[in-house]
Interface confidence: low
């Protein structure tokens, strides 16, 4: 239904609190360098304006689109060109081109310092003195570092943050209470960020059809008792919601997401038997709970997939009459039978089935041609299963840090031209797959591993796109989204790479490493490891182990020394010499 004033409509639907949070996220994702104070001023102005439109939908400018209103606000910021350079050129355009222009200037790797968590006491004081401002800062800091973060989900994490602080700030040992709880929220939020970026990449590069296929597979796995028509409706809605959020229409996105949650809860009987617990929660928690819902039980009486898609004599006729519906039905039927497969794998199988029909239905004896298609799926299924098996075994043997290092060596050899910070970030994230997935029951491992790896590799692609340096990475990133992970897995040592010169300063360390938190120490060591591989791409595992072991001992020894600076200054050159020798 059309509304006279879009902004009044959204304000009424969302409520002031969520409206303000979403506007703050929107501004922070568009203008990532502006300080909180500047954004909050704009948020208040937009909120006050929305309230006037609620009171009188015919008031001046209330009929303007939200993009127009937001864009006008952003373009009115003084010194926009000084701070944002060519982004200011967007302001010369009209909607919808202006918004498209803003979207293109979103920076996936903004030059911002890492988000530092304040000390527990200070955190609690500022939270208790002004919880709204404290959580506003949280939204701002996360949104500007993750310009594609799914906005309604970020509101949910802010709510979680709020709950943790409220609980822990009245405890005697605040830090002991806060640290593990906030670490857990942070970990979940970071995974959510890369997953959503992948969804937006899918939408941007391959359009709504590709995203909807992903949604059909995912929904079919979760709700195997739902009819195909129901799954299609849910997938269409989810596609619309994600398109809105990826496109910067955050108010509409959050509103539609709440509507979808409402619809699902009103139609549990035709969707899933597992929804009730979610449906009793408030709106943000309800939507999040539904997004994370466990799979419903698979119906006991499902016939073989072959009946309708291989043995039926009308396969080619059904395919020709309505290709998308027929392939959608195949994806639905296959996915609901396989909650143990990754969505990427299910989409590869659907693609293989489509290619088989395209070829066979044009031949003289189609049934004879496509009759073996299900058997031809086997190698496609075995490949990710083997990937999971070998990587989980390696993780169990080495632990998270050792596994990250193994992945770092592997990926530096595959793409040594990529910058060391990007390789270290990617390897650390890829390496976390072990902790995240390898401890799960067998049936959950494959979907967890492959879909997580795909999201992390998408982040690598997004960063590489900004400054392309490796032809191999470009090739894997340019292809289909579902083929990326197999493409990266298949890469071997880049033979075209000319090894980096050995620079002593790259391996020179100072006493400041001693006071770093464990995570930062690990990153320093992993940076050195990547640089070693760039110097000697064909170094053996034993050579690298020797050098890294020597390095760890050197750091340990000097950090325990009475005169740390002197130890680093004198022992450092010896370490460099020994390392060069070990790698010769």
């Amino acid at each position: 239904e059309a509304h006279k004033s879009e902004i009044a409509h959204r304000f009424k639907d969302l409520g002031e609190q969520h409206f303000k949070g979403l506007v703050l996220i929107a501004f922070s994702q568009y203008l990532q360098k502006c300080p909180y104070e500047e954004h909050i001023k704009l948020v208040q102005e937009v909120t006050d304006f929305a309230k006037t439109c609620v009171a009188d939908e015919n008031a001046e400018n209330c009929d303007k689109s939200i993009h127009t209103l937001f864009g006008d606000k952003l373009c009115a910021i003084p010194k926009l060109r000084d701070n944002y350079g060519e982004l200011a050129d967007c302001c010369a355009k009209q909607e919808p081109e202006r918004n498209e222009c803003f979207l293109q200037h979103k920076d996936d790797n903004p030059n911002l310092p890492p988000f530092q968590r304040p000390e527990a006491e200070a955190m609690c004081t500022s939270f208790q003195e002004n919880p709204t401002s404290f959580l506003g800062h949280y939204l701002h800091e996360v949104a500007r570092r993750h310009p594609y973060f799914y906005a309604p989900e970020l509101l949910y994490y802010a709510e979680k943050y709020n709950e943790v602080l409220t609980q822990c700030c009245t405890e005697s040992d605040k830090a002991a209470c806060l640290t593990p709880k906030l670490d857990a929220v942070k970990e979940k939020a970071l995974v959510a960020a890369v997953r959503q970026r992948m969804k937006c990449s899918s939408m941007q590069r391959f359009g709504e059809r590709a995203f909807k296929a992903w949604a059909v597979a995912r929904m079919s796995q979760r709700f195997p008792n739902a009819e195909f028509a129901e799954i299609t409706k849910l997938a269409t809605d989810v596609t619309k919601i994600n398109k809105e959020c990826c496109h910067g229409d955050l108010l509409e996105c959050a509103d539609d997401r709440a509507e979808l949650a409402k619809y699902m809860c009103e139609n549990q009987a035709t969707i899933s038997s597992k929804l009730q617990a979610c449906c009793d929660k408030p709106v943000l928690q309800k939507s999040q709970c539904l997004a994370e819902i466990e799979h419903d039980n698979i119906p006991a009486d499902l016939p073989s997939i072959a009946a309708d898609f291989v043995e039926d004599k009308e396969v080619c006729k059904n395919y020709a009459e309505a290709k998308d519906v027929f392939l959608g039905t195949f994806l639905y039927e296959y996915s609901r039978r396989h909650p143990d497969y990754s969505v990427s794998l299910l989409l590869r199988l659907a693609k293989k089935y489509e290619a088989t029909l395209e070829k066979c239905c044009a031949e003289g004896d189609p049934p004879a041609c496509y009759g073996t298609v299900l058997a031809e799926f086997q190698p496609l299924v075995e490949e990710p299963k083997n990937l999971v098996k070998t990587n989980c075994e390696l993780y169990e043997k080495l632990g998270e840090y050792g596994f990250q290092n193994a992945v770092l060596v592997r990926y530096t050899q595959k793409a040594p031209q990529v910058s060391t910070p990007t390789l270290v970030e990617a390897a650390r994230n890829l390496g976390r797959v072990g902790t995240k997935c390898c401890t799960l029951p067998e049936a959950q491992r494959l979907p967890c591993v492959e879909d997580y790896l795909s999201a992390i590799l998408n982040r690598l692609c997004v960063l590489h796109e900004k400054t392309p340096v490796s032809e191999k990475v470009t090739k894997c990133c340019s292809g289909s989204l579902v083929e990326r992970r197999p493409c990266f897995s298949a890469l071997t040592v880049d033979e075209t790479y000319v090894p980096k010169e050995f620079k002593a300063e790259t391996f020179t360390f100072h006493s400041d490493i001693c006071t770093l938190p464990d995570k930062e120490k690990q990153i320093k060591k992993q940076t050195a490891l990547a640089e070693l591989v760039k110097h000697k791409p064909k170094a053996t595992e034993d050579q690298l182990k020797t050098v890294m072991g020597d390095f760890a001992q050197f750091v340990d020894k000097c950090c325990k020394a009475a005169d740390k600076d002197n130890c680093f200054a004198t022992e450092g050159p010896n370490l460099v010499a020994r390392s060069k020798e070990a790698l010769a």
Epitope: Q17, H18, L135, G136, A158, N162, Q167, T170
Partner: nanobody, 123 residues
Amino acid sequence: EVQLVESGGGEVQPGGSLRLSCAASGFAFSTSGMVWVRQAPGKGLEWVSTISDDARIIRYAESVKGRFTISRDNAKNTLYLQMNSLRAEDTAVYYCATYRAGSRIGSYEDYYWGQGTLVTVKP
């Protein structure tokens, strides 16, 4: 059903004292952190003080430090606020509140409230 009932407000001269009480029921008082919040005429809500469930953690807003004392009696399910050296700017409705697992982000809407008790400081 959660109930918080404040009492002890009234009119007092600058420099005077009052003791506010808050009787709690309908939730696990002895395991809940409690707060006092106030709202001066025509102003927004202002956090005054927090006390943890076991009373080991106590915090005050800068504006009341050294003058107000928060305390609780878990056996009686009651929260207190002793207010000394009262000033004209302390005039407000005082509410006691306890956190409710959040339905919104970072706002006082996250709390269960009492109906408030009015404190007026005037010469």
